[in-house]
């Protein structure tokens, strides 16, 4: 299986892409020799090889073409060469070898002529037991994959050399690279190509957002001389309508919105609002679709509910409670309250006017959370017209009409106000003689007093009833010695009043006789 | 250019020895083996054996031991191939061949133009 | 000792046509066999050797493949200089050749 080249190698050589003939250099002339040969997949190559393995003395070079040292500071030398074993030549023990010789020269100039003495030594190179298996025929051949390190390296360029001294060897490939830290986007930052230093210290690189991201803790990377990115710190978060996808922040796509910076995804656009374009922060209302001022962008859009339904009034007098349901659609929200209209009307409905300061509204007139209103103080007799509106957190937001419902009532007259003071004027054995004063407010001609007694140890299981024209009243055919318990009401053409409250008296024993004496409860 | 020169033909007498020579130039004698190849007339090949031109160290193959020598002048960059007690049989043309030794496989690249040897009584 | 046997004895080809000998061994062979060219009165000369590398001068319509014990010979287009006897030849610690196969006009 081919294995990639790791992306933070950087070749500055590598004879298996070279086309045609390599054209290295080879002293003396009969010893390395180019031929056609294949690597480890069977890809047709150019290769060197020598195996002048017969002679004692063998000292055979070749030097690759000069190579640029680009921004290397470190360079690293792969070799991939087959070695024959020397068992497997017949007459050449003693005289062949299993090892060759790798040499270096630096030099900022490319046209130096060869010469064994410039060159440095770089190691022995031998077969380990690192070999790739290379199925020729039948034999196996061992293909050893050799890597050393130079560095470091300060001229413009250098050569590579290879001294065979009698080994049978063909360098199926060369490849000279220096490691590098690869573009990388790490947590939203893009870190850039970096060549590490040749010593062991790290490489501190600032990192850049990405397009539509911005800092959120400044991105560093450290680069370490094997070419790898370490210890990322810091990051960047993509902004409002962008979310991270890969190594990118990307628009978020139309029906979808993001609303602020950072890590979260783009968002399905909520209800009844959409986006047409890419990169949306929020999402727009619909038609005749709102959202409140302080409704997140998470929101769905709403529109004002519906009017209320089914309006019922129950008018007592001069009070009315007005009942209704809620309404039948929403509009999507559910902070929904009741504001009450009241207007005062003439005969003719239309001519209408807002009700006196003076009416009344238990709990309230507006904000109203449950669906039920008492409205008091009403004039007596008197046509109303109630609109109760149904309103939510968008209503204000929207252009008339107002969603409400209306209903018209006319008060009855309103009934006399109590009694308020009792007072016993004379008693009796047999009798008690009352007064009273005019309830503060009469609200109409009173036409009579009712009167009401008992016993007081009967507990009202027995009384009596009788009227009074006028506001005193004498009571007979009563028990002597007795405490007997009095509430009054007065009547007009509205009815009764409510009853005063009650009020206790006495009748005298036997031959006596008291008066002007006030009640007591 | 590399070459090998050898001697004529030579017509020898049974149990007579013969002494083929093999003069290589345009190389250095000493860095290649040479194979010696036999082929009877109207034959195919047949591979005699080599020498190690620079230690004088011979192989032979099988059926070629006892009456067959190689050997080596090395001053005079000559190969010779030594062959007794000659039967009529051993009648053929008598090739010398430098050997090419690679990682991936032998042959033989450079021939002489063969001695022809003719034993007859 | 390992035997090779080639096929066909002689082959009877056209100029321009393709030719394909074949070498078989009588046991896996340690690797690529060689191959020889011989003409009439000459000595005979190397083709391809080691990983079916042609030798000098030999034109790229030779080519050699296989493994194990069957070796083939390719001759893509035959041209008239072509027509000779060709060997195939295993080494190891003792070499041998094949019989050889000749290409002759057909």
């Known amino acids: 299986e081919l294995s990639p080249q790791p992306s933070n190698e950087v070749n500055l050589l590598d004879s298996k892409t070279i086309q045609g003939e390599l054209g290295w250099i080879s002293y003396p002339s009969h010893g390395w020799e180019e031929i056609s040969g294949v690597d480890e997949h069977y890809t047709p190559i150019r290769t060197y090889q020598v195996c002048n393995v017969m002679d004692h003395s063998q000292n055979n070079w070749l030097r690759t073409n000069w190579v640029p040292r680009n921004s290397a500071q470190k360079i690293y030398v792969e070799l991939k060469f087959t070695l024959r074993d020397c068992n497997s030549i017949p007459l050449v023990l003693g005289t062949c070898k299993e090892t060759f010789n790798l040499y270096y020269m630096e030099s900022d100039d490319h046209g130096v002529k060869f010469r064994e003495h410039q060159f440095t030594k770089i190691d022995t190179i031998a077969a380990d037991e690192s070999f790739t298996q290379m199925d020729l025929g039948d034999r196996i051949l061992k293909l050893n994959t050799e890597i050393r390190e130079v560095g470091p390296v300060n001229k413009k360029g250098f050569y590579l050399a290879f001294q065979d001294v009698g080994a049978c060897v063909a360098l199926v490939s060369v490849r000279v690279y220096f490691k590098k830290c690869p573009f990388t986007v790490k947590n939203l930052a893009m870190f850039p190509d970096t060549v590490p230093m040749d010593s062991q210290s790290l490489v501190e690189v600032r990192g850049s957002c990405v397009n539509n991201s911005k800092e959120e803790d400044p991105p560093r990377m450290y680069c370490s001389t094997e070419g790898e990115w370490l210890v990322p710190i810091g990051k960047c978060t993509c902004n409002a309508g962008y979310e991270e996808r890969g190594f990118i922040c990307q628009a978020c796509r139309p029906g979808f919105y993001k609303a602020s910076d950072g890590a979260a995804k783009c968002a399905k656009c909520p209800p009844h609002s959409s986006t047409q374009e890419d990169g949306s922060m929020n999402c727009r209302c619909e038609n005749n679709y709102f959202r409140a001022e302080k409704d997140p962008p998470s929101m769905a859009c709403a529109r004002p509910p519906s009017a209320p339904r089914n309006v019922i009034s129950n008018i007592n007098e001069t009070s009315v409670i007005l009942d209704w349901s809620w309404p039948l659609d929403t509009g999507g929200r559910k902070d929904i309250t009741f504001n009450i209209i009241c207007k005062k009307c003439g005969w003719n409905v239309r001519q209408c006017e807002p009700c006196s300061p003076n009416v009344r509204f238990l709990p309230r007139q507006l904000g109203l959370t449950n669906t039920t209103v008492t409205v008091t103080d009403l004039l007596a007799h008197t046509n109303y017209t109630f609109e109760i509106d149904a309103v939510n957190g968008v209503s204000e937001l929207s252009s008339p009409p107002r969603q409400y419902a209306a209903v018209s009532i006319t008060t009855n007259q309103a009934a006399p106000s109590p009694v308020m003071t009792i007072k016993k004027d004379r008693t009796s054995r047999n009798s008690i003689s009352l007064s009273w004063q005019e309830p503060e407010h009469p609200n109409g001609i009173i036409l009579d007093y009712e009167v009401k007694y008992y016993q007081k140890q009967e507990q009202e299981t027995s009384y009596t009833i009788l009227r009074a024209r006028g506001t005193n009243v004498t009571i007979s055919s009563l028990k002597p010695d007795t405490t007997y318990v009095f509430q009054i009401r007065a009547r007009t053409a509205a009815g009764y009043g409510t009853n005063s409250r009650k009020f206790e008296f006495e009748t005298s024993p036997d031959s006596f006789s008291i008066s002007g004496e006030n009640s007591h409860v | 250019q590399v070459q090998l020169l050898q001697s004529g033909a030579e017509v020898k007498k049974p149990g007579a020895s013969v002494k083929v020579p093999c003069k290589a130039s345009?190389?250095?004698?000493?860095?290649?083996?040479m194979s010696w190849v036999r082929q009877a007339p109207g034959q195919g090949l047949e591979w005699m054996g080599w020498i190690n031109t620079n230690t004088g160290n011979p192989t032979y193959a099988q059926g070629f031991t006892g009456r067959f020598v190689f050997s080596l002048d090395t001053s005079v960059s000559t190969a010779y191939l030594q062959i007794s007690s000659l039967k009529a049989e051993d009648t053929a043309v008598y090739y010398c061949?430098?050997?090419?030794?690679?990682?991936?496989?032998?042959?033989?690249?450079?021939w002489g133009q063969g001695t022809l040897v003719t034993v007859s009584s | 000792e390992i035997v090779l046997t080639q096929s066909p004895a002689t082959l009877s080809v056209s100029p321009g046509e393709r030719a394909t000998l074949s070498c078989r061994a009588s046991?896996?062979?340690?690797?690529?066999p060689a191959w020889y060219q011989q003409k009439p009165g000459q000595a005979p000369r190397l083709l391809i050797y080691g990983l079916s590398t042609r030798a000098t001068g030999i034109p790229d319509r030779f080519s050699a493949s296989g493994s194990g014990t069957d070796f083939t010979l390719t001759i893509s287009r035959v041209e008239p200089e072509d027509f000779a006897v060709y060997y195939c030849q295993q080494y190891g610690p003792s070499w041998t050749f094949g019989q050889g196969t000749k290409v002759e006009i057909k």
């Open positions: 046991q896996s062979v340690s690797s690529n």
């Open positions: 345009g190389y250095t004698f000493t860095s290649r083996a």
């Open positions: 061949a430098r050997v090419r030794l690679t990682v991936y496989g032998d042959g033989m690249d450079v």
